[in-house]
């Protein structure tokens, strides 16, 4: 049986992916062929097959970016360390491990889905924008994130949350594959206006906040939340 | 995303021979462990024969001594020689690589069928 698990990694960092026989296992390297693959698209990752030291059949995607230990390997630990994690790695992987000597029988099928994390960039908010008499319009945008973000507009005066339907937002995959974000929100013309833009992060359990008042040009101090209670409770703990 | 092409089936009398066929587009058929498997109906899916990069063979006990697995690197291809086919040989025969076995995943396969 194949087992599953799941590890989460900030890109640009170095991950292990777990693939291990219990402890006090001994193999064989001429004996063994393991192989890590992605689940979905079948592309080799790395591998190791008796009598041969060559990786040119690793993807060009993973070469010099997924390595298993040797020494590891000998007592049974096959696990996988990806550097430089990239969200295009955000994927299921698979490690399979047989042995010639027994038929090449399945030893160790290991399934691991890997999560990717980037923080988004402090939000930006504009200073109010008046494109008619009676409208504010404020933009806030926020960079360099991972996964798609949740974009919240705050009543600051009282921490209720806006109507999502006077926000327009923006979301766009940059070249690093990575999201940018752009809301614009557009209320209505009131004598005083103390709003906040929350970016959220649902991966990383992080809200990034920031405020804007009328008559006001520097934004309030930035607020950074992480681990806020459950989503029912959300309003009321993370945007105090 | 590896191809594997499976031919040579079809339909032969008891005693009679076959050779099948299966040609990998992949590029990482030298690495590849192959197997030939086989599915009769109303039956599972069975592991026939597996030869690892090195040309070493593994056989099910059903085919011992009649069956024979061997692969080209060169041409990224695996065979398996059938010989003194019997009558419940008769199934649909896959190739595939171990490590694609493990995710589920399957070609067309071939039809054989052995007439008494």
């Known amino acids: 049986d194949t087992q599953e698990k799941e590890v989460r990694a900030m890109v640009g960092s170095d991950v292990e992916l777990s693939c291990a026989c219990p402890e006090g296992s001994r193999f064989d390297l001429n004996d063994v062929y393991v192989y890590w693959q992605t689940s979905e698209s079948k592309t080799v990752v790395t591998y190791h097959i008796p009598q041969n030291s060559s990786l040119e059949n690793v993807d060009s995607r993973y070469r010099n970016r997924a390595l298993m230990s040797p020494a590891g390997m000998l007592r049974g630990d096959f696990s996988l360390r990806l550097f430089n994690v990239t969200p295009q790695d955000e994927q299921k992987f698979h490690c399979l491990v047989l042995s010639q000597s027994l038929g090449f029988q399945e030893v160790l099928s290991v399934e691991v889905t890997l999560h990717v994390a980037a923080n988004f960039s402090v939000p930006v908010v504009s200073a109010p924008h008046s494109p008619s008499q009676d409208e504010l319009t404020f933009t806030c945008t926020s960079i360099n994130g991972y996964p798609r973000p949740n974009v919240y507009w705050i009543n600051k005066t009282d921490n209720s949350l806006l109507d999502q339907a006077l926000q327009n937002d923006t979301v766009f995959l940059n070249m690093r594959g990575l999201y940018d974000v752009v809301s614009v929100l557009r209320i209505a013309r009131t004598p005083s206006v103390n709003i906040g833009c929350c970016i959220e992060n649902v991966l990383l359990q992080q809200n990034l906040t920031v405020g804007s008042q009328t008559g006001n040009d520097i934004g309030e101090r930035d607020k950074i939340t992480e681990n806020p209670v459950s989503t029912g409770e959300k309003n009321a703990a993370t945007w105090s | 995303e590896v191809q594997l092409v499976e031919s040579g089936g079809g339909l032969v009398q008891a005693g009679g021979s076959l050779r099948l066929s299966c040609a990998s587009s992949g590029s990482t058929f030298s690495i590849d462990v192959m197997g030939w498997y086989r599915q009769a109906p109303g039956k599972v899916r069975e592991r026939v024969a597996i030869?690892?990069?090195?040309?070493?063979?593994v056989y099910a006990d059903s085919v011992k001594g009649r069956f024979t697995i061997s692969r080209d690197n060169a041409k990224n291809t695996v065979y398996l020689q059938m010989n003194s086919l019997k009558p419940e040989d008769t199934a649909v025969y896959y190739c595939n690589a171990a490590r694609l076995v493990a995710l589920g995943s399957w070609g067309q396969g071939t039809q054989v069928t052995v007439s008494s």
């Open positions: 030869i690892g990069t090195g040309g070493f063979p």
